[in-house]
Amino acid sequence: QPSVSPGEPSPPSIHPGKSDLIVRVGDEIRLLCTDPGFVKWTFEILDETNENKQNEWITEKAEATNTGKYTCTNKHGLSNSIYVFVRDPAKLFLVDRSLYGKEDNDTLVRCPLTDPEVTNYSLKGCQGKPLPKDLRFIPDPKAGIMIKSVKRAYHRLCLHCSVDQEGKSVLSEKFILKVRPAFKAVPVVSVSKASYLLREGEEFTVTCTIKDVSSSVYSTWKRENSQTKLQEKYNSWHHGDFNYERQATLTISSARVNDSGVFMCYANNTFGSANVTTTLEVVDKGFINIFPMINTTVFVNDGENVDLIVEYEAFPKPEHQQWIYMNRTFTDKWEDYPKSENESNIRYVSELHLTRLKGTEGGTYTFLVSNSDVNAAIAFNVYVNTKPEILTYDRLVNGMLQCVAAGFPEPTIDWYFCPGTEQRCSASVLPVDVQTLNSSGPPFGKLVVQSSIDSSAFKHNGTVECKAYNDVGKTSAYFNFAFKGNNKEQIHPHTLFTP
């Protein structure tokens, strides 16, 4: 019994005066608390308590469930305790089978004994299975068995408390350990699509997938720069232990333009947080934007190939595409395809393949595209570069020499005089008149140039060269002159192609 110095309040005294008492099932428990300031008896087992205001605690026929700690308390708050074991061979353990363990922490298997004199108080696996090799425990007959540093691998471990009684192993009811994992990484979050494009009134629905070790992970959809509570629906699955998946679906049943913005799926646990975003763009009506991939004015050499390429954004998806030239629709020679196979793709490519173009095939080539909301078009002006062709070369009645050439770009005509029999005509002659003839004609055809010189300027026999040229090539025509007396006459005009 406790001893204190006189004058100081002392704890109550209990009879019988021992710390532990063993009684047999069916026997009487009689405990007397002696204290001038007696307040109450408290009985506690498996962390449950009962009180008694009588100073003598009497249980006429003891049962195993009367096993526990009996505490007498006085008015000074001082107390004294005795632990009573009610030995019942048929009920060696008192149990509370709720068994939760937090990873890396200790947890108590609550199976206190009713008989302290049994031996080998320990834990055993169910169905004769061994316990994990690294499982360590500390038995306490009055409380149960403490498992040290719970591991994730112990989740749903089936256990019995076990003792040896008269040489036989006796097992308690089964305990199933539920381990709450410690978060050792941030949640993994992903979103069904990174961006959405909708028309007003259409439904916006996006799903965020959150993966973590347990359902304790927190997740929410947030609108960036907004505190508005968003409506979400959840589905969740446990794919085995510590592999939890949640799908959080955000829905706006009828999207409006002002719903456009960035939506964040945010998840956190005690280790940290993670997020992923998706962008919503709501337009009042559909659109088509066309982007030429080459200049819309195209120059191509005669006989060469050219590809007219456009990229275009179309929402909703394009329904009709066509290429047109001179009011005729191409049935082949073109292809149209999405820029990406991505589900959210709105960008497309259209290519018209023009092969071995002739000088007569210049003109306006138009790409037209439409969807359910809008039409759009883009025109390419195609110019076919052709080397000059000398259409006419004549000596006119007024004594002028005239050369007419056609080509694209517009040819330049130069005149040269070669005295006598020289092959090289280097002396240039200035034209009297130069005209572009068909500027009022079709815009993409060859350009026709007329140039004239005065033949009276030539006093000797020789050859006059009319040379028409542009970026593509050159062509020449020749006038041969011979003087017979005072008369000059033109002999054998002929052309000579010079590449």
Epitope: D47, E48, V95, S98, Y100, K102, Q127, I176, S214, S215
Partner: antibody, heavy 117, light 111 residues
């Protein structure tokens, strides 16, 4: 004997918060998990979450995540459940329940929370 | 989450009748042969009261006319002979894994 006594009925405006208390007696408060369950008028029972014994960590039903917080005051053996951003859908009777031997062996008497403009 | 579906949703019976209520889980609630399924009784304006725990164990103080059976996904609550005080709503509940879930309830009425 074990008793769970809850705080009285509350009337709240939409958008407000409510904090329901559950005072425990008859057992060692820190040794048992405390769960919260609610029941809307004429409806069934819905588990809201649990505050575990020992470390006092919590696990919430995702439906209430971000709005619910469960705490304890061990000095008074009282558990608390706070629910924020209330709407009319949160009108319900809220119960605390002690988990004992794998089941909800003890329940509080319930606290009616009415959310009304 | 594990979804519990009770049937019937409501039931009319007379005093002395034998009544059976079933509860089906969307997945097994068993761990090592232990079924984490419980049954509760609730009367209007009162808190639920535990009747049966771990599928078949009678809670202390509950009359023996109540019994539970089943394992895995299919469970049954049986009242062998209805008494007037048994007219109430009955719920099954699983705590194999979180979130813990309840059945939608079976209302037992007097015929």
């Amino acid at each position: 004997q074990v008793q769970l006594v809850q705080s009285g009925a509350e009337v709240k405006k939409p958008g407000a918060s409510v904090k329901v208390s559950c005072k425990a007696s008859g057992y060692t408060f820190t040794s048992y998990n405390m769960h919260w369950v609610r029941q809307a008028p004429g409806q069934g029972l819905e588990w809201m979450g649990v505050i575990y014994s020992g470390q006092g960590d919590t696990s919430y039903n995702q439906k209430f995540k971000g709005r619910v917080t469960m705490t304890t005051d061990t000095s008074t053996s009282t558990a608390y459940m706070e629910l924020r951003s209330l709407t009319s859908d949160d009108t319900a009777v809220y119960y605390c329940a002690r988990e004992r031997d794998t089941r909800f062996g003890n329940w509080g008497q319930g606290t009616l929370v009415t959310v009304s403009a | 989450e594990i979804v519990l579906t009770q049937s019937p949703s409501s039931l009319s019976a007379s005093v002395g009748d034998r009544v059976t209520i079933t509860c089906r889980a969307s997945e097994s609630v068993d761990i090592y042969g232990e079924s984490f399924m419980h049954w509760y009784q609730q009367k209007p304006g009162k808190a639920p009261k535990l009747l049966i725990y771990l599928a078949s164990n009678l809670e202390s103080g509950v009359p023996s006319r109540f019994s539970g059976s089943g394992s895995g996904t299919d469970f049954t609550l049986t009242i062998s002979s209805l008494q007037p005080e048994d007219f109430a709503t009955y719920y099954c509940q699983q705590n194999k894994e979180e979130p813990y879930t309840f059945g939608q309830g079976t209302k037992l009425e007097i015929k």
